[in-house]
């Protein structure tokens, strides 16, 4: 019989519903298992006006190393903020920079991805390896990108609809589920039912859905149903703060005793068949009914009790409400500038307005030195001669001020101006790990140490080595030692840092062929970064320094010729 | 099956300038781009340039930048390359190929190829 | 512009013979893509990521390399390879071709 019950949207303060999924518009994965670079590529849609992403990156330790390089290519078609985490990876990342602002310096090496369409984006990207994964992601909040995982049958990544990433991707949708919900009419009580389907996915591996569930109710106000449909290789791990009647497809297990698997029921799969499941259990309200794609975690909130639904009369908001100003984001959003002889401060309006910040000022330390209004930003600039700048042997600083409507204090942030004229980077070789007494001749089979310092020292920048390689001439040829901030092989090591933090590294060289080379030329780039700050103000530089080479050894590791 | 169907041989005037077409089947045409290779006789291959047919975004061999002009009609997924000033050094074979990103980019498919003669 | 250079230009080996061929680049590159073109036929993608067999390829034929040399190796020469073999390479722009290697039966 017909269950008469008409499903109507819920008020997001009834109950949302959030998910993480690895189902895509769009996608691929492949294994690329001998390739130099794994390469992934993202193509992120998001609704006008600027969008806040997470993004993380992450990779498990393989045979006790740190996995290949990775290229990852990001695609945006508006203005994101982007909170990048990618500790401990070697990462290129290739992006628009015009559309992307990292939320903090990503402290990883970046190219700028040309405007291609899509097509020429994967071919850009091809062209620099094969690609392990693509995908097609529509206003992600959150993106979870785990490297060395391809599970892909497939030996190339060619975009298809409707793809399952598995565990190489899972992303949060922005956008929370539409959650329904309705009176089930003739049933007394107050009983009410929370209605889950999951909807099957590209493909059909086991898969375990992790459901947390939290009712904003006194624990004996509730007489509860939980009703979980999906398509039978999911199993569901629930993790719920309120006793109620689980009914579920395929195996269940609780968080607190998860080793503890309880068969379900066959269920209906059509949102009919479900509604009378929940009348049949004894349910008078559908609380909220939620259908979602295959996801690896579902979070329902909801705040029912089993009184009174209120289903919302019009069309709802599905994105949750903006937070009030957060004056911290907002003075990270303040770039610098420096060129000229001159410092400039740069706060684009978009951003600002995102925030849902109102600026009345925003000035240097000098309160006469006030920011231009240029109609899409503000523009603050001086010399290095006035507006209270400080000036040092290595550096010009100053203060931003901003004054924002909703604090009664102005924020204040510091921001300096590397002095190039007066920085001198040096390459130092040592022969021993005390790093005591510099050298310039290399022994092949013998140990060498490299230190790279920049004087006068900068406190409030990072000295970082993105790559260095040893030229050996024609003979020779070239041995990378490092590569984007990565040893190179297992003949290099990167040390810890000097007490002034100046980066190290070891090498070992040996020769399997003769003539052995009697001079090289060690060159490395080098990069000071600010410790926090935009990543406008890095600052490269190559550095060189010849090397003599004695006494030949046929033995053992770098091998070149 | 993909196809890219080339237009036939062509003996043309020294200083004269001459179209050919490239009409492909068999596949989406906005996923991939379209490339032009020349051959002289005998010699190895020239890339001269690619187009996209999603925008008719073109991308050329700065040697080829005054001589050729690529151009699509979606409607018919045709590819043309238009060539002007001919001289004898444009006597030629001209494959068009189809680029694929999961073969690394690679050209997967090629035209027949159109032989071209430039004589007085 | 990246000039690769194939040796040798011309080259004839017997039925059952391994063979290699060269392509060298005048700068590092990170991947070559092989090339198979019949008298009067057009090129086919026979090799793509130096060492990936494209569909239908021969599992005799194999490539290797790195840098800025690489090869294209025949287990044991059969027929229907009599070929003119290009190398070629797509990581610096403008894409570039090498000069052929031409390989007859013995």
């Known amino acids: 019989e017909t269950v008469h019950c008409d499903l109507q949207p819920v008020g997001p303060e009834r109950g949302e519903v959030t998910y993480t999924t690895s189902q895509v518009s769009k996608g691929c994965v492949a294994q690329a298992p001998n390739a130099i670079l794994e390469v992934h590529v993202l193509f992120l849609e998001f609704p006008t006006g600027p969008s806040q992403l997470e993004l993380t990156l992450q990779a498990s330790k393989q045979n006790g190393t740190w996995p290949r390089e990775v290229l990852l290519v990001l695609s945006v078609n508006s203005s994101v903020f982007l909170h990048l985490q990618a500790l401990g990876i070697p990462l290129h990342l290739a992006y628009n920079s015009s559309l992307v602002t990292f939320q903090e310096p990503p402290g990883v090496n970046t190219t700028e991805l040309p405007s291609f369409p899509k097509t020429q984006i994967l071919e850009w990207a091809a062209e620099r390896g094969p690609i392990t994964s693509a995908a097609e992601l529509n206003d992600p909040q959150s993106i979870l990108l785990r490297l060395g995982q391809a599970q892909g049958s497939l030996s190339f990544c060619m975009l298809e609809a409707s793809q399952d990433m598995g565990r190489t991707l899972e992303w949060r949708p922005r956008t929370p589920a539409l959650v329904r919900g309705c009176h089930l009419e003739g049933v007394a009580g107050h009983k009410e039912a929370h209605i889950l389907r999951v909807l099957p996915g590209h493909s059909a591996g086991p898969r375990t859905v992790t459901v947390k569930v939290e009712l904003s109710c006194a624990p004996g106000d509730l007489d509860a149903v939980l009703i979980l449909q999906g398509p039978p290789y999911v199993s569901w791990l629930i993790d719920a703060n309120h006793n109620m009647q689980i009914w579920t497809t395929g195996e269940y297990s609780f968080k607190i005793f998860p080793e503890k698997n309880i068969r379900g029921f066959k269920l209906p799969d059509t949102p009919q068949g479900l509604l009378g499941e929940a009348r049949m259990l004894n349910a008078s309200i559908v609380a909220s009914f939620v259908e979602l794609p295959l996801a690896s975690i579902v979070s329902l909130h909801a705040s029912s009790c089993g009184g009174r639904l209120q289903t919302s009369p019009a069309p709802i908001q599905t994105t949750p409400p903006k937070d009030t100003c957060s004056p911290e984001l907002l003075m990270s959003l303040i770039q610098t500038k420096c060129a000229d002889d001159a410092m400039t401060l740069v706060l684009k309006k978009e951003l600002v307005a995102h925030l849902k910040c109102t600026i009345t000022g925003l000035t240097f330390w000098d309160p006469s030195c006030e920011a231009e209004d240029r109609g899409d930003k503000f523009v603050l600039r001086s010399a290095y001669s006035s507006c209270g700048m400080q000036v040092s042997a290595s550096m010009i600083s100053n203060e931003a001020v901003v004054n924002i409507l909703s604090s009664s204090s102005p924020q204040r942030k510091k921001v300096h101006c590397l002095n190039m004229d007066s920085l001198s980077f040096q390459l130092g070789l040592y022969l021993s790990p005390h790093f005591l007494q510099a050298s310039n001749t290399i022994e092949p089979g013998q140990q060498s140490f490299v230190q790279v310092r920049v004087s006068p020292s900068v406190s409030e920048f990072l000295l970082q080595l993105d790559s260095c390689h040893l030229d050996l001439g024609p003979e020779g040829g070239t041995v990378e030692l490092i590569q984007g901030r990565a040893a190179k092989g297992n003949c290099v090591s990167l040390l810890s840092p000097s007490p002034e933090g100046d980066p190290r590294f070891s090498f070992l060289l040996h020769f399997y062929t003769v003539p052995i080379p009697k001079t090289g030329t060690l060159s490395c780039t080098v990069a000071l970064r600010p410790k926090t700050g935009s990543q406008d103000q890095e600052v490269h530089r190559t550095v060189f320094m010849r090397l003599n080479i004695i006494s030949p050894d046929l033995s053992g590791c770098t091998s070149k010729g | 099956e993909v196809q890219l169907e080339q237009s036939g041989p062509e003996v043309v005037k020294p200083g004269t300038s001459v179209k050919i077409s490239c009409k492909t089947s068999?596949?989406?045409?906005?996923?991939?781009?379209l490339h032009w290779i020349k051959q002289n006789q005998g010699k190895s291959l020239e890339w001269i340039g690619g187009?996209?047919?999603?925008?008719?975004?073109?991308t050329y061999r700065q040697k080829f930048k005054d001589k050729a002009t690529l151009t699509v009609d979606k409607s018919s997924s045709t590819a043309f390359m238009e060539l002007r000033s001919l001289t004898s050094d444009d006597s030629a074979v001209y494959f068009c190929?189809?680029?694929?990103?999961?073969?690394?980019?690679?050209?997967?498919?090629w035209g027949q190829g159109t032989t071209l003669t430039v004589s007085s | 512009e990246n000039v690769l250079t194939q040796s040798p230009a011309i080259m004839s080996a017997s039925l059952g013979e391994k063979v290699t061929m060269t392509c060298r680049a005048s700068s590092s590159v990170n991947y070559v893509y092989w090339y198979q073109q019949k008298s009067d036929a057009s090129p086919k993608l026979w090799i793509y990521?130096?060492?990936n067999l494209a569909p239908g390829v021969p599992a005799r034929f194999s490539g290797s390399g790195s840098g800025n040399s690489y090869s294209l190796t025949i287990s044991s020469m059969e027929g229907e390879d009599a070929a003119t073999y290009y190398c070629q390479q797509f990581i610096s722009f403008p894409y570039t071709f090498g000069g052929g290697t031409k390989l007859e039966i013995k």
């Open positions: 068999g596949y989406t045409i906005t996923e991939h781009t």
């Open positions: 187009i996209n047919f999603d925008n008719g975004g073109t």
């Open positions: 990521y130096t060492s």
């Open positions: 190929a189809r680029r694929a990103y999961y073969y690394g980019s690679a050209f997967d498919y």
